[in-house]
């Protein structure tokens, strides 16, 4: 019936932990891809869309080789926190047009939140230094028009897709070094 009191709990295999994180990330990447297709289908918008408040893409795939696990996880968590905030903002601020993307957008938010908790757990299991709590981010500016909101949605989902794609490749590469 469990280890005797005071004895250290058996630490799960970090590679298995990383595997399940990759699985979650892959699943979220697919959710994001599907939602992006839905958004483009319902609200076509040509060209690239940028949002100044979004994080810049962490790293090109080619530069992944030089990365270390702590820096990847730290950066990934920070970027995904930003995307979570943007998805929450999107769901509350964007008007009835984007309500047609529910419940998928809500599911995306829930799964993004779950991935963030998983990353936090992974960082503690790997005994990585815990980050101080993030300073409160400035509130996101309201869209000036519905169209501005739609463009923001394209930018958020497009950026999240790229970030998750980078994350899957980065985590798989780092797993080989554990």
């Amino acid at each position: 019936p469990g280890p005797p009191p005071g004895s250290p709990r058996a630490s799960p295999d970090p590679r298995a932990e990383l595997d399940s994180t990759v699985l979650l990330t892959r699943s979220l990447l697919e959710d994001t891809r599907q939602l992006t297709i839905q958004l483009k289908d319902k609200f076509p918008a040509d060209g690239d869309h940028n949002l100044d408040s979004l994080p810049t893409l962490a790293m090109s795939a080619g530069a992944l080789g030089a990365l270390q696990l702590p820096s990847v996880l730290t950066r990934l968590r920070a970027d995904l926190l930003s995307y979570l905030r943007h998805v929450q903002w999107l769901r509350r601020a964007m008007g009835s047009s984007l309500k047609t993307l529910e419940p998928e957008l809500g599911t995306l938010q829930t799964r993004l939140d779950r991935l963030l908790r998983r990353l936090q757990l992974l960082m503690s299991r790997l005994a990585l230094p815990q980050l101080p709590p993030d300073p409160p981010a400035p509130p996101l500016a309201p869209p000036s028009s519905t169209w501005g909101g739609i463009r923001a949605a394209h930018a958020i989902l497009g950026g999240l897709h790229l970030t998750l794609d980078w994350a899957v490749r980065g985590l798989l590469l780092l797993k080989t070094r554990l």
Partner: antibody, heavy 117, light 111 residues
């Protein structure tokens, strides 16, 4: 400056139809969702319907569903509300309103619809 | 019966601070932004507060909005006679797929 001007109101008998228009100017009409909101005499505000910026998505209040149709013509910068099977309880001032999200940042002056026999 | 609940009336004397409450549920105020409108007698409503606590340009900083859980409130400090009007709260409701309003609060400035 932003302007919304409603027209088409008047006195109509129960069961009849009426079409309201809202002419927009001073902004890029096709970039905004548009709503209709009404106010019965001496009563509060009641949301009626919304149409998305490009016209494909529409939502209605339960009280008008199946009777009212919201539409828009972006080439004419005009919003419409087709009201069929009118009832006495539809008597109200009807406002069109612009929205960048869920808040109405500009309102028209309103047009009065009276349903009476 | 309105989906959002507001007191039917409120009053105060010039210079005073008054607060108008707006109570809703998890499907409206709890998960969406709250807006406040002022309607002066015989005129169309005017946006006063949006995104829970933001003021459009031209609205004096005497007006402020706040939200906690499924309730919101509008505070008016330094009350003036021209503030006498009807005030409405509103939010999108996810269950109804539409905008909901409070029944409105008639503010009277005494004296």
């Amino acid at each position: 400056q932003v302007q919304l001007v409603e027209s088409g109101g008047g006195v109509v008998q129960p069961g009849r139809s009426l079409r309201l228009s809202c002419a927009a100017s001073g902004f890029t009409f096709s970039h905004y969702d548009m709503h209709w909101v009404r106010q019965a005499p001496g009563k509060g505000l009641e949301w009626v319907a919304v149409i998305s910026y490009e016209g494909s998505n529409k939502f209605y209040a339960d009280s008008v569903k199946g009777r009212f149709t919201i539409s828009r013509d972006n080439s004419k910068n005009t919003l419409y509300l087709q009201m069929n099977s009118l009832r006495a309880e539809d008597t109200a001032v009807y406002y069109c309103a612009r929205t960048p999200g869920f808040h109405f940042d500009y309102w028209g002056q309103g047009t009065l619809v009276t349903v009476s026999s | 019966q309105s989906v959002l609940t507001q007191p039917p009336s409120a009053s105060g004397t010039p210079g005073q601070r008054v607060t108008i409450s707006c109570s809703g549920s998890s499907s409206n105020i709890g998960s969406n932004y709250v807006n406040w409108y002022q309607q002066l007698p015989g005129t169309a409503p005017k946006l006063l507060i949006y995104y829970d606590d933001l003021r459009p340009s031209g609205v004096p900083d005497r007006f402020s909005g706040s939200k906690s859980g499924t309730s919101a409130s509008l505070a008016i400090s330094g009350l003036r006679s021209e503030d006498e009007a009807d005030y409405y709260c509103s939010a999108w409701d996810d269950s109804l797929s539409g905008v909901v309003f409070g029944g409105g609060t008639k503010l009277t400035v005494l004296g």
